[in-house]
């Protein structure tokens, strides 16, 4: 059974992941640049189901494409430093989903824009945090 301290750690990690994803989305929403149109043409795979921590495997598999898209946005008004950001997210995701379980991610048929992708994973974090508080 999960201990109080392990639940607290999970909640803190989820809060960090949530903030990181919100920070990316805020950066994109603030981004008034021709590159934004190009960013929105990139397609991301969405999970068929995302209700448990193991489903973060689906997010992990899309982190490299996410970094590539964010690299497009680099400018003096985009402060997210994609390599550091994705590295940080990756560490959190690995800790949250655990490395001992091998979960094969199932993706939905429809792909999504970066904004839809971020909103999906933000909602995932928010719903799990809500069950923990």
């Amino acid at each position: 059974a999960p201990t109080s301290s392990s639940t607290k750690k999970t909640q803190l990690q989820l809060e960090h992941l949530l903030l990181d994803l919100q920070m990316i989305l805020n950066g994109i929403n603030n981004y008034k640049n021709p590159k934004l149109t190009r960013m929105l043409t990139f397609k991301f795979y969405m999970p068929k189901k995302a209700t448990e921590l193991k489903h973060l495997q689906c997010l992990e598999e899309e982190l490299k494409p996410l970094e590539e898209v964010l690299n497009l946005a680099q400018s003096k008004n985009f402060h997210l430093r994609p390599r550091d950001l994705i590295s940080n997210i990756n560490v959190i995701v690995l800790e949250l989903k655990g490395s001992e379980t091998t979960f094969m991610c199932e993706y939905a048929d429809e792909t999504a824009t970066i904004v839809e992708f971020l909103n999906r994973w933000i909602t995932f974090c928010q719903s799990i945090i809500s069950t923990l508080t």
Epitope: L19, D20, Q22, M23, R81, D84, Q126, S130, T133
Partner: antibody, heavy 113, light 107 residues
Framework: QVQLVQSGAEVKKPGASVKVSCKAS????????IHWVRQAPGQGLEWMGI????????SYALKFQGRVTMTRDTSTSTVYMELSSLRSEDTAVYYC??????WGQGTLVTVSS | DIQMTQSPSSLSASVGDRVTITCRAS??????LAWYQQKPGKAPKLLIY???SLQSGVPSRFSGSGSGTDFTLTISSLQPEDFATYYC?????????FGQGTRLEIK
């Protein structure tokens, strides 16, 4: 216990820059992202932005983008907020907040010619 | 950006009164709402998080309710130390936004 201690009051001329510090103690520095919020005299609270203390990346409110820079020094567990091209409307108390539970005492920045 | 609208903007009440402050979001924020109390010259103090969870150390006379777009902060029996300004805040999405505040004064 958790403490966020901010630098002292500043008086600046229009067009100048100000750098406010926020020193954290009593917890693991990387555990709480730091928000900056300001409050003009007699007014409400206004979110300026956030910094991830582990990796140092930031996200700002659109209103402040291009004028604000948030940085951190992990060796001293200190976060900084620099606001440039100051104008009279920037006269306010500036707060840092860690995880919304713990707040600094506030730093009054007065912009006057 | 999500707009947070508080009402009333000011309120006069007496010690022992039951007081309710409302906060409305311009779009659904689920339960991602917090309430703060601020006294003159002091930093805001977190009272309620996740719309209805009482922050540790906050007296039980404070309670929060609501979800979606409509939220309330209730003080069941006003104490002298409760006269202050109260703010709601959404953290559902960035930019984080606050209500304009409700000033609670002694009648």
């Amino acid at each position: 216990q958790v403490q966020l201690v901010q630098s002292g009051a500043e008086v600046k001329k229009p067009g100048a820059s100000v750098k406010v510090s926020c020193k954290a103690s009593g917890y693991t520095f990387t555990n709480y992202y730091i928000h900056w919020v300001r409050q003009a005299p007699g007014q409400g609270l206004e979110w300026m932005g956030i910094i991830n203390p582990r990796a140092g990346y930031t996200s700002y409110a659109l209103k402040f983008q291009g004028r604000v820079t948030m940085t951190r020094d992990t060796s001293t567990s200190t976060v900084y907020m620099e606001l440039s091209s100051l104008r009279s409307e920037d006269t306010a108390v500036y707060y840092c907040a860690g995880g919304w539970l713990d707040w600094g005492q506030g730093t009054l920045v007065t912009v006057s010619s | 950006d999500i707009q947070m609208t508080q009402s009333p903007s000011s309120l006069s009440a007496s010690v022992g009164d039951r007081v309710t402050i409302t906060c409305r979001a311009s779009q659904s924020i689920s339960s991602w709402l917090a309430w703060y109390q601020q006294k003159p010259g002091k930093a805001p103090k977190l009272l309620i998080y996740a719309a209805s969870s009482l922050q540790s150390g906050v007296p039980s006379r404070f309670s929060g309710s609501g979800s979606g777009t409509d939220f309330t902060l209730t003080i069941s029996s006003l104490q002298p130390e409760d006269f202050a300004t109260y703010y709601c805040q959404q953290s559902f999405t960035m930019p984080i936004t606050f209500g304009q505040g409700t000033r609670l004064e002694i009648k």
